[in-house]
């Protein structure tokens, strides 16, 4: 669910995950419509899609946890039901995404207004 | 309506080889895993392995390992699982069962008899 | 691999009773999944991740728990509840049952 995200995101990333990606770019945090503003928000939209394949397919996004291991920057996902692996998964995937580029993180997209984004 | 379908399992040799199947209807195998699990008075539930319909991937209980072989054809919707050189301890129910929040639909299970 | 412990073996209820069987297991698991068995019947998914009640099962059923040690509990037993029980384990594999707790109509 969005702790575990939130938590895999700190400990991967070292940064606050809602003051540096809840309102990032046009699809990082609730929603996402327009063009991605850069890496770290092409990020944003591969997990948001990645999540639609996951509710499509029966899990609950917001809500269906998981458990995972962190140890020496390696997020491992634990066993468990189909909607646990693959949610975990996703979750992986982003973190190690939003790691990748946090060089080009932009703080003028940190809060980016919705209204922007087309 | 979620339903799995049941069958291949009959009165068989010692020795012998069979090959269950479970035919999904209202859902794609692919969107979850689908798990074998064997059931007899005792000791009772026993998981047996599973498979990613999607790519093929499969984990197995080491017991039934060599024993056991799970495979999926995405096509027909259909996960197999194959049972070699039967003996008086494969006697069993076998059931297969959909995992996406958990094991939330199982099949009606099939009684395989091995007998000679 | 992870060997779940259900207790009681059997146990018996009157309509109405409050009922509560236990899954204990060998190391800690990060949840616990409950299944409901009746006679000539496939098991059925009643609790997932600990405490979350399967679609279309009575409200009356909860479950609770954490580390090695976990319940399922039906507060008032009806007589549709007569079967047998089953905790499962997904925290390491192989997967693994528990014996069951058969639950029987005083």
């Known amino acids: 669910g969005l702790l575990d995200l939130k938590s895999m995101i700190e400990k991967v990333t070292g940064k606050n995950a809602l003051t540096n990606y809840g309102f990032y770019g046009c699809y990082c945090g609730w929603g996402g419509r327009g063009t991605p503003k850069d890496g770290t928000d092409w990020c944003c939209w591969a997990h948001d899609h990645c999540y639609g394949r996951l509710e499509e397919k029966g899990c609950n996004i917001r809500t269906q946890s998981y458990k995972y291991r962190f140890a020496w920057g390696v997020v491992t996902c634990e066993p468990g039901p189909f909607c646990h692996v693959n949610l975990c998964a996703c979750d992986r995937k982003l973190v190690y995404c939003l790691k990748r580029n946090l060089r080009s993180y932009n703080p003028q997209y940190q809060y980016f207004p919705n209204i922007l984004c087309s | 309506e979620v339903q799995l379908q049941l069958s291949g399992a009959d009165l068989v040799k010692p020795g012998a080889s069979v090959k269950l199947s479970c035919t999904a209807s209202?859902?794609?195998?692919?969107?979850?895993?689908i798990h074998w699990v064997k059931q007899r008075p005792e000791p009772g539930l026993e998981w047996i392995g599973r498979?990613?319909?999607?790519?093929?991937?499969?984990k197995y209980d080491p017991k039934f390992q060599g024993k056991a072989t799970i495979t999926a054809d995405t096509s027909s919707n259909t996960a197999y699982l194959q049972l070699t050189s039967l003996t008086s301890e494969d006697t069993a129910v076998y059931y297969c069962?959909?995992?996406?929040?958990?094991?939330?639909?199982w099949g009606q299970g099939t009684t395989l008899t091995v007998s000679s | 691999q992870i060997v779940l412990t259900q207790s009681p073996a059997i146990m018996s209820a009157s309509p109405g009773e409050k009922v509560t069987m236990t899954c204990s297991a060998s190391?800690?698991?990060?949840?616990m999944y409950w299944y409901q068995q009746k006679p000539g019947s496939s098991p059925r998914l009643l609790i997932y991740?600990?405490?979350n009640l399967a679609s279309g099962v009575p409200v009356r059923f909860s479950g609770s728990g954490s580390g090695t040690s976990y319940s399922l509990t039906i507060s008032r037993m009806e007589a549709e509840d007569a079967a047998t029980y089953y905790c499962?384990?997904?925290?390491?594999?192989?997967?693994?049952f528990g014996a069951g707790t058969k639950l029987e109509l005083k």
């Open positions: 069962a959909r995992d996406v929040v958990a094991l939330d639909y």
């Open positions: 209202g859902f794609n195998i692919k969107d979850s895993y």
């Open positions: 498979i990613d319909p999607a790519n093929g991937n499969t």
């Open positions: 190391s800690s698991v990060s949840y």
């Open positions: 991740d600990t405490s």
């Open positions: 499962q384990q997904w925290s390491s594999y192989p997967l693994t």
